[in-house]
């Protein structure tokens, strides 16, 4: 079995303020079992945008039904984009752990740029 890769096919995405951004992410394997998380930025100060396992993220919806059998599509939509949302977004696969899930592999990132609403 080939080791799982996290694919973020879009290096950059441009979205108008007030619109919805779609950030694409797929995994290449069902193994290892574990959730996906999305972050803005990298390193210790990164901001959690979405966690499949737990939490409440009212602006975020998943593109695919995560409970769908054998799902490997972890793309998300972020609604009502503002200039403050600009940055690089990383899709990160975690593997099921005991007791806590462990970060396994990150996608290469997608840079979100926000175009101001024409006045």
């Amino acid at each position: 079995e080939e080791e799982l890769q996290v694919i973020q096919p879009d290096k950059s995405v441009l979205v108008a303020a007030g619109e919805t951004a779609t950030l694409r992410c797929t995994a290449t394997s069902l193994i290892p079992v574990g959730p996906i998380q999305w972050f803005r930025g990298a390193g210790p100060g990164r901001e959690l945008i979405y966690n499949q396992k737990e939490g409440h993220f009212p602006r975020v919806t998943t593109v695919s039904d995560l409970t769908k059998r054998n799902n490997m599509d972890f793309s998300i939509r972020i609604g009502n984009i503002t200039p403050a949302d600009a940055g690089t977004y990383y899709c990160v696969k975690f593997r099921k752990g005991s007791p806590d899930d462990v970060e396994f592999k990150s996608g290469a990132g997608t840079e979100l740029s926000v175009r101001a609403k024409p006045s």
Partner: antibody, heavy 119, light 110 residues
Framework: QVQLVQSGAEVKKPGASVKVSCKAS????????INWVRQAPGQGLEWIAM????????HYNQIFKDRATLTTDTSTSTAYMELRSLRSDDTAVYYC????????????WGRGTLVTVSS | DIVLTQSPDSLAVSLGERATINCRAS??????????IFWYQQKPGQPPKLLIY???NLDPGVPDRFSGSGSGTDFTLTISSLQAEDVAVYYC????????FGQGTKLEIK
């Protein structure tokens, strides 16, 4: 930490119904399937059915299709399994179990609820 | 329905020796390169515990003396060096279609 806490033991008369509950915590309830499995005294494991709490999609073992009903209450992160027209051979420990990988497997289990059917 | 048949029904192995449990499916449980077989351990008075997923992948926290192998219709759970705490009943389960379990194999110490 994923936890599945089941309701207490029940004693029922033949022909009656029983409703077993399974309260989930430590994860987003709507993102993962819940399975129900039973085990008669000294016997093996028997899969009953599964439910997707996000949309109440269910799959049933044909043996239980006419007598079992799975439901969920997303406001309390609780899954329910009701079994009707009880017979003495329904005496068993009933388990709920969560599928963490959408593989139709059982990663995390409740401790079980003993249902005794006796006149 | 896919029927899983485990062999043997019971097994006695000396401490430190290898234990092997087999699970045969009535038809293939493989799809898209994955083998939809899972192994569980159940000790008396406890719920089952997932050991192996997708035939050969060790669940986190499971000692590496446990391993799974096989494809298609024939699968094996192996304990390389039996420990006292491994005494339990072991079940295979498939999810190629709706889940079913094997009948279980009781593992004891010789």
């Amino acid at each position: 930490q994923v936890q599945l806490v089941q309701s207490g033991a029940e004693v029922k008369k033949p022909g009656a119904s029983v409703k077993v509950s399974c309260k989930a915590s430590g994860y987003t309830f709507t993102n993962y399937w819940i399975n129900w499995v039973r085990q008669a005294p000294g016997q093996g494991l028997e899969w009953i059915a599964m439910i997707d709490p996000s949309d109440s999609e269910t799959h049933y073992n044909q043996i239980f299709k006419d007598r079992a009903t799975l439901t969920t209450d997303t406001s309390t992160s609780t899954a329910y399994m009701e079994l009707r027209s009880l017979r003495s051979d329904d005496t068993a420990v009933y388990y709920c179990a969560m599928d963490y990988g959408s593989l139709y497997a059982m990663d995390y289990w409740g401790r079980g609820t003993l249902v005794t059917v006796s006149s | 329905d896919i029927v899983l048949t485990q062999s043997p029904d019971s097994l006695a192995v000396s401490l430190g020796e290898r234990a092997t449990i087999n699970c045969r499916a009535s038809k293939s449980v493989s799809s898209s390169g994955y083998n939809y077989i899972f192994w569980y351990q159940q000790k008396p008075g406890q719920p089952p515990k997932l050991l192996i997923y997708l035939a050969s992948n060790l669940d986190p926290g499971v000692p590496d003396r446990f391993s799974g192998s096989g494809s298609g219709t024939d699968f094996t759970l192996t304990i390389s060096s039996l420990q006292a705490e491994d005494v339990a009943v072991y079940y295979c389960q498939h999810s190629r279609e709706l889940p079913t379990f094997g009948q279980g194999t009781k593992l004891e110490i010789k």
